[in-house]
């Protein structure tokens, strides 16, 4: 009695299971009752990723540099090509099909973690002793300046943007 | 002068072969990206693939994919394009273009785009029994 | 795939007057960088493309001021402010946010 269903990595065509094709490789004809499946190797710049009866390959993506992407992995005949953004830009998504350019921390806020090919740069207020100045994409919060350290007092106060003016302590008339 | 010059046309029967070459002068080949672009008699403008500078990634329109190759040796400062299984709707002028870019440095030129600013003169494939 | 319409598909034009083309494209060629990545290219009779005009509205090296690009997402036009006799021949745009790339049919100019 032909089969209903067929072992993994089969298929079952004409009432019986056939091999399907392994990674790398696409269908080129189906068994029979005397020939085994056969199977034909994906040609440079294709793949298939999964066991399959795909007549035709993928072709791996195009990392495209109009939209500020590169190759980080080229692809196989198993694998897709994997995509990056150039340096100062991050994927907008996790398929990496476009880039967007680092977000920069404005003044208050400091760079927690800078930015990736993959990750946007993530930024957090500056806290109390700490200030920022500049908008960046790169440079964490600083502390501010000890006066003390410099003999010397704090004239105006900090803030999470502006550090200490320090200034000279007043002598006391003899 | 920046100059592509292709070759490799002719007249070829259904099914058979044929390579082009588009031999590139005046600057430096292995820093641009190159596509090929075809023109049928009469007709518009249909582009046919892309490949990257090192050569490491390329793709291919729907309508060759499976029997057109785009390769290149930039040592040899060339581009080719290797047609098999060649169909009678493949006759066309083909056309080599270069991707014009902008040089890198400041945050936005990495991917600053300079439109396909410099095209060879064509090779005519003729695919006829 | 991104389709791309121009009109009109044929123009005749007065030496001294200004044209104007327009393509559409099916989806917007706005990408996140604020560039519009639409181009448009020339093929005089008998010779190869040339570009005129790249992401959107910037006019290539060499080509005369009376060419302009302009439009944004989906809408754009390229104009000619004063046609000249040398301007004839098929005016394409393509789109380059997208592989594959894909042009407009064509424009044919031709002096009236």
């Known amino acids: 009695e032909p089969p209903t269903a067929c072992r993994e990595k089969q298929y079952l065509i004409n009432s019986q299971c056939c091999s399907l094709c392994q990674p790398g490789q696409k269908l080129v004809s189906d068994c029979t009752e005397f020939t085994e499946t056969e199977c034909l190797p994906c040609s440079e710049s294709e793949f298939l990723d999964t066991w399959n009866r795909e007549t035709r390959c993928h072709q791996h993506k195009y990392c495209d540099p109009n939209l500020g992407l590169r190759v980080q992995q080229k692809g196989t005949s198993e694998t897709d090509t994997i995509c990056t953004c150039e340096e100062g830009l991050h994927c907008m998504s996790e398929s990496c099909e476009s880039c967007v350019p680092h977000r920069s921390c404005l003044p208050g806020f400091g760079v927690k973690q800078i930015a990736t090919g993959v990750s946007d740069t993530i930024c957090e207020p500056c806290p109390v002793g700490f200030f920022s100045n500049v908008s960046s994409a790169f440079e964490k919060c600083r502390p501010w300046t000890s006066c003390e350290t410099k003999d010397l007092v704090v004239q105006q106060a900090g803030t999470n943007k502006t550090d200490v003016v320090c200034g000279p302590q007043d002598r006391q008339r003899a | 002068q920046v100059q592509l010059v292709e070759s490799g046309g002719g007249v070829v029967q259904p099914g058979r072969s044929l390579r082009l070459s588009c031999a590139a002068s005046?600057?430096?080949?292995?820093?641009?990206?190159m596509h090929w672009v075809r023109q049928a008699p009469g007709k518009g403008l249909e582009w046919v693939a892309v490949i990257s500078n090192d050569g490491d990634n390329k793709y291919h329109a729907d309508s060759v994919w499976g029997r057109f190759t785009i390769s290149r040796d930039n040592s040899r400062s060339t581009l080719y394009l290797q047609m098999n299984s060649l169909r009678a709707e493949d006759t066309a002028v083909y056309y080599c273009?270069?991707?014009?870019?902008?040089?890198?440095?400041?945050?936005?030129?990495?991917?600053?785009?300079?439109?396909?600013?410099?095209w060879g003169q064509g090779t005519t494939v003729t695919v006829s029994s | 795939d991104i389709v791309m319409t121009q009109s009109p598909l044929s123009l005749p034009v007065t030496p001294g007057e200004p044209a104007s083309i327009s393509c559409r494209s099916s989806q917007s060629l706005l990408y996140s960088n604020g560039y519009n990545f639409l181009d448009w290219y020339l093929q005089k009779p008998g010779q190869s493309p040339q570009l005129l005009i790249y992401l959107g509205s910037n006019r290539a090296s060499g080509v005369p001021d009376r060419f302009s690009g302009s439009g944004s997402g989906t809408d754009f036009t390229l104009k000619i402010s004063r046609v000249e006799a040398e301007d004839v021949g098929v005016y394409y745009c393509m789109q380059a946010l997208q592989t594959p790339r894909t042009f407009g049919q064509g424009t044919k100019v031709e002096i009236k």
């Open positions: 005046g600057f430096t080949f292995s820093s641009y990206g």
């Open positions: 273009a270069r991707r014009g870019m902008g040089s890198s440095g400041s945050r936005g030129d990495y991917y600053y785009y300079y439109g396909l600013d410099v």
